[in-house]
């Protein structure tokens, strides 16, 4: 058998440290069998039988130069294997982030904090944390590990699926790579990194007869999961063409009627989500849709009780959006029934 | 005991090939570079190449790129070496020689290739 | 490509005499050079190798020293049985490379 451990990574590849003394192991003698070593492709001997270093090559504060393929060779001249030096640093402990699209799953991505130059994987796992009391800092003997299963192909990404949202998660990332291990650890709760994906299919449509208003409709992403408990609340901005600042509302349902729209304008609107009570942070904005009021006389209003918006239509204070207001709802696949009180006194 | 079989002699027409064999035995074939080399009365000794038998990788003297071709067949323990365009400067004793990477432990008896119309 | 240069061309000696052969490099080569020794219609056969080590089967009489250029073999006492043509070879650089030899002769 090979007196050459094998350290992970391809056959027949050693490895060592820029500015380090490397040894090179001869993989196909008896250990402390003497060799000579040629670097292939060169005659010279590097270092021969009679170095008292039996079957390994030692190399002072190696540097690049150094690297490539070296041929160790036994006293009579048998071929003992051909071994590649390659060069490298050991694994730093890497940079991990951990995000949530929903509440029963999230995800964590890392990246090396220093490049290795070696062949390097990730191992990916982690431990639920559990409360013991309300009041009590101590916690539970933690349960697991689990392995936290690796996307394929490569990406950097681990997802844990079935996650509960009010418990605690350490996530351990170890980078591994020939010359060592280092691992990152991390705790995560999936309040703090709940972060809903953006709404869908937001629609902005005009208001016939209204030529200051726009209605937006949008559904819920479609990674929130179907289940009544956890809502979404929302966030609406939009703004005229070529205007800098956009005006901020907080609709209570899926939809939005904008009345201060300015007259012949197209206008962007977008929106946003966030966990109903407020656990993590808003989504990032979802793709700008577009409408223009449409044209046409107003028709006398009748006054209604609970207008979403009761200002005149003037020219809109776009810098001040308006205050937020409470935005429970039913669940995004049942019909929202709030009567668009407005839509009633137009038709009347 | 270690041996290399060559065939004593070989006359070729000047433009032809020739393939020079070379039978190995009492060792194991593939642990050992094979050598070949060209001896002539005045010109003394000269390095052809090498080949390595586990994987045919070869190092050839650059002046005999061109003229010589080294291959091995592990199967029969037997290295090749194909001399292409022979001319009278061809006329010599080829060497084959087990050696290490670059030293030539065990000779051949050698083969004297005559190049003549 | 080394050039190796060997001197004398010829030696003629006696059984019983101490012989050195020279052997001198055209660039310094550290200790990357051998000696053989080749009798009449023999192949040749590896004497020494890296300048010093000697080898299994050649008689102990048969010795080698030098670094850098210069070369020397050496035998204390020459037997009948040594006379042929000596040959060193470098292995410094490709392509590896002979000197022309020098000739041992009875005197």
């Known amino acids: 058998s090979s007196p050459c451990p094998q350290a992970w990574g391809p056959p027949g590849v050693q490895y060592g440290q820029p500015g380090r003394s490397v040894k090179l192991c001869c993989p196909g003698v008896t250990a402390g069998d003497p060799v000579s070593w040629f670097r292939d492709g060169e005659p010279k001997l590097l270092q021969g039988p009679d170095s008292g270093l039996g079957h390994e090559l030692v190399l002072a504060q190696a540097d690049s130069t150094d690297e490539g393929t070296y041929i160790c060779q036994t006293l009579d001249g048998a071929l003992g294997g051909t071994v590649t030096l390659q060069l490298g640093y050991p694994p730093a402990r890497p940079v991990v982030s951990c995000q949530a699209a929903d509440y029963e799953n999230f995800s964590c991505t890392w990246s090396p904090s220093q490049i290795s130059g070696l062949p390097t994987r990730y191992l990916t796992s982690y431990r639920k944390k559990t409360v013991l009391g309300a009041d009590s800092q101590r916690r539970s003997p933690s349960t697991g590990p689990w392995p936290c299963p690796q996307d394929p192909l490569g990406a950097a990404r681990c997802v844990v699926h079935g996650a509960e949202f009010w418990s605690q998660y350490r996530i351990n990332v170890t980078e591994v790579n020939p010359l060592g291990a280092s691992t990152r650890l991390l705790d995560v709760s999936l309040q703090s990194i709940l972060r809903p994906d953006p709404p869908q299919g937001l629609r902005v449509e005009s208001v016939p007869g209204y030529p200051r208003r726009l209605r937006a409709s949008w559904t819920y992403p479609a990674s929130w999961p179907c289940q009544p408990h956890f809502l979404l609340k929302f966030r609406l901005q939009y703004r005229p063409a070529q205007h800098p600042a956009w005006s901020t509302v907080e609709p209570a349902g899926l939809e939005e009627v904008i009345t201060d729209a300015v007259a012949g304008l197209p206008h962007a609107v977008r929106v946003s989500a966030r966990d109903f009570l407020d656990a993590g942070t808003w989504s990032t904005w979802s793709p700008e849709a577009w409408g223009t009021p449409s044209t046409g006389t107003i028709p006398k209003e009748i006054p209604a009780w609970g207008q979403l918006h009761t200002q005149p239509e003037v020219e809109p204070q776009v810098d001040s959006p308006a205050p937020p207001r409470p935005s429970l709802q039913p669940h995004p696949r049942l019909l929202d029934h709030r009567d668009s009180v407005e839509q009633v006194a137009v038709l009347a | 005991q270690v041996q290399l079989q060559q065939p004593g002699a070989e006359l070729v027409r000047p433009g032809s090939s020739v393939k020079l064999s070379c039978k190995a035995s009492g060792y194991t074939f593939t642990n050992y570079w094979m050598h070949w080399l060209k001896q002539r009365p005045v010109q003394g000794l000269e390095w052809i190449g090498n080949?390595?038998?586990?994987?045919?990788?070869?190092h050839y003297n650059q002046k005999f790129k061109d003229k010589a071709t080294l291959t091995v067949d592990k199967s029969s323990s037997t290295a090749y070496m194909q001399l292409n365009s022979l001319t009278s400067e061809d006329s010599a004793v080829y060497y084959c020689?087990?050696?290490?990477?670059?030293?030539?432990?065990?000779w051949g008896q050698g083969t004297l290739v005559t190049v003549s119309a | 490509d080394i050039v190796l240069t060997q001197s004398p061309a010829t030696l003629s000696m006696t059984p019983g005499d101490s012989v050195s052969l020279s052997c001198r490099a055209s660039q310094s080569i550290s200790n990357n050079l051998h000696w053989y020794q080749q009798k009449s219609h023999e192949s040749p056969r590896l004497l020494i190798k890296?300048?010093?080590q000697s080898i299994s089967g050649i008689p102990s009489r048969f010795s080698g020293s030098g670094s850098g250029t210069d070369f020397t073999l050496s035998f204390n006492s020459v037997e009948t049985e040594d006379f042929g043509v000596y040959f060193c070879?470098?292995?410094?650089?490709?392509?590896?490379?002979f000197g022309a030899g020098t000739k041992l002769e009875l005197k």
């Open positions: 080949i390595g038998p586990s994987d045919s990788k070869t």
């Open positions: 890296y300048a010093s």
């Open positions: 070879q470098q292995s410094y650089s490709w392509p590896l490379t």
């Open positions: 020689a087990r050696g290490d990477y670059v030293l030539f432990t065990y």
